[in-house]
């Protein structure tokens, strides 16, 4: 390409007509402020092409970058561009306009800006100020661009003198965004909710503080769109939020929400998503399974556990035997409820050291005013067994017997087991069990009775001995679900005239 | 971590001449605009001259003419010539950003003009 005049540089008087031509071997145009202003084209007959651009009755405003360039999208050499600057001094003219958006100047990053004040004549002195102060910041200046720097968070203005006349420019406004990658949240007031309730939902960036938020969600499919609203939260660091709220949730309005999230700056981009369920009405529903019979073991304590979804939060209550349990003040018994999820609860009943009265037929009842939901339960308090007494005695008829009374809950299981060496029993010879129907040496009666008031079963067994010809440890085991108890007794011949 | 070294000063007559150095290392030096600093005892730090990434330059009025600052970014340093010193010269003097400094101040290096 060659321009003539070539410039770079060119100082032109007002109200003066004058001619640029730009010539190459490709069609050729003059763009200035990224528009072709009106020019002749030609092409000679040695098949270059030119273009002429007369600018006429020159005033500042006529001041700026011209550029020649290639006009075909073939692209000979489609980047080479010829630059000329132009200079039309005007006293008339002061700063030259700026477009709105040049007088923000947006930075992400430490890096060199420029505040492009210009002049329409290279001769004056232009120096720049911040907008609060007179001190000329010693900064460097191009006729051409306007000063250069590293700039703070600040408003800026330059000044010049036309003549006698001192000229300020706009003011500059330089700001420092906060963009960091993209860290977006999403939650809702509710995840569940009732028709006619409202859905609210919040997306949340932290780190930035340019973006753009977008909402889909299931209203929007069928055109009904809803506006959000945008603010920021006032700690650091920059916390934006959009409010996407629904007033009057219809079931239509179940569905997928996604908030999503762009950084123009980086051109970063995040998206979250929540589901919302709109139901027709509330509901409470038992998860997992409670047996119809649950135990606890006396004197120790037992939590008692039901876990259920709800919508909206129910009222609990527990019952014992249709009467409505509190927390007790003796701390015997404890009640609590707690949210584990948006919808789902566990409910617990606590029995610290249980006692025997705290047997019983016990209820969980979850309630609002749209379902409620029951569960019972008998609770079984376990006794571990002890053997009350062991007694040996001769009755008439010469056969010796042994008896053995326990009690426990649940009905403990009886073993009676006798051992004839006395130094090696139990420790080097295992005791023989006694009692099983094939022994004719022993025979055995048991008897068991259930108390109401103390809820456990009692057990008797009578061991009936045919022939004792030597000292015989003779043993009572009582086993039940929670434990075992024992107790021996000496069985001597009647011709013996001791027992031990 | 971006670091500024500044070296060549020293102890010189009014009237003479010394030419310091600042190396900037582990940043985008060609992207920044970089001046000088200095700081007299008991004053103010206060801007001396900058030099853009294209290399246009300013200086304050009290060195204006005397002080010639000017960049390398192959070598990612940046230059101040300083001719004619006076005693009001006397500083500590610093390089950074420009004009308003975003890099951890370095060192500094004592110029001092004295008969």
């Known amino acids: 390409l060659v321009v003539t005049p070539p410039g770079p540089e060119l100082v032109l008087n007002v109200s003066s007509t004058f001619v640029l031509t730009c010539s190459g071997s490709a069609p050729v145009v003059w763009e200035r402020m990224s528009q072709e202003p009106p020019q002749e084209m030609a092409k000679a007959q040695d098949g270059t092409f030119s273009s002429v651009l007369t600018l006429t009755n020159l005033t500042g405003l006529d001041t700026g970058e011209y550029f020649c360039t290639h006009n075909d999208s073939r692209g000979l050499e489609t980047d080479e561009r010829k630059r000329l600057y132009i200079f039309v001094p005007d006293p008339t003219v002061g700063f030259l306009p700026n477009d709105a958006e040049e007088l923000f100047i947006f930075l992400t990053e430490i890096t060199e800006i420029t505040i492009p004040c210009r002049v329409t004549d290279p001769q004056l002195v232009v120096t720049l100020h911040e907008k609060k102060g007179d001190v000329a910041l010693p900064v460097p200046y191009d006729h051409q661009r306007g000063f250069s720097g590293i700039f703070e968070d600040r408003s800026y203005i330059c000044k010049t003198t036309i003549g006698d006349r001192e000229v300020d420019s706009d003011a500059y406004y330089v700001y420092r965004l906060q963009v960091s990658s993209i860290n977006v949240s999403v939650n809702a007031v509710q995840t569940v909710v009732r028709q006619g309730e409202n859905i609210t939902l919040m997306c949340i960036v932290i780190g930035n503080e340019v973006v753009n938020f977008e909402w889909t969600y299931p209203r929007k499919e069928s055109g009904r769109l809803v506006e959000p609203v945008t603010d920021f939260l006032l700690d650091m660091p920059y916390h934006i939020r959009s409010i996407l709220h629904i007033p009057s949730a219809e079931l239509e309005d179940s569905g997928t929400y996604t908030c999503n999230v762009t950084e123009s700056v980086n051109d970063h981009q995040d998206e979250k998503a929540i589901n919302i369920t709109v139901v027709e009405s509330g509901y409470v529903r038992l998860l997992g399974e409670v047996g119809t019979l649950q135990f606890a073991e006396l004197h120790r304590s037992r939590t008692l556990q039901v876990v259920f979804e709800a919508y909206p939060p129910p009222t609990v209550l527990w019952f014992k035997d249709n009467r409505t349990l509190g927390d007790s003040s003796a701390g015997e018994i404890a009640l609590s409820t707690r949210n584990v999820s948006e919808t789902r609860y566990v409910s617990e009943l606590t029995l610290v050291r249980v006692k025997v009265a705290e047997a019983g037929h016990y209820t969980m009842r979850a309630f609002h005013e749209d379902a409620e939901v029951q569960l019972s339960f008998q609770l079984q308090i376990n006794v571990p067994v002890r053997v009350l007494e062991l007694s040996e005695s001769h009755p008439d008829s010469g056969e010796q017997t042994v008896r053995c009374r326990g009690r426990g809950m649940p009905q403990p299981n009886i073993i009676w087991s006798a051992c004839r060496d006395l130094k090696r029993c139990p420790r080097e010879l295992p005791p023989t069990l006694l009692g099983n129907s094939s022994e004719e040496e022993s025979q055995l009666e048991t008897n068991v009775t259930y108390w109401e008031e103390e809820q456990e079963f009692e057990v008797v067994s009578t061991l009936r001995l045919q022939h004792v010809d030597r000292p015989l440890s003779v043993r009572c085991t009582l086993r039940n679900a929670v434990g075992q108890d024992t107790q021996e007794v000496i069985v001597v011949p009647h011709s013996l005239p001791f027992k031990v | 971590e971006v670091q500024l070294v500044e070296s060549g000063g020293g102890l010189v007559q009014p009237g003479g001449s010394l030419r310091l150095s600042c190396v900037v290392s582990?940043?985008?030096?060609?992207?920044?605009?970089m001046g000088w600093f200095r700081r007299a005892p008991g004053k103010q730090r206060e801007l001396v001259a900058g030099v853009s990434t294209v290399g246009d330059t300013a200086a304050a009025d009290s060195v204006k003419g005397r002080f010639t600052i000017s960049r390398d970014n192959a070598k990612n340093t940046v230059y101040l010539q300083m001719n004619s010193l006076k005693p009001e010269d006397t500083a500590v003097y610093y390089c950074n950003t420009y004009p308003h400094a975003y890099l951890e101040w370095g060192q500094g290096t004592q110029v001092t003009v004295s008969s």
């Open positions: 582990g940043s985008s030096f060609s992207s920044y605009t």
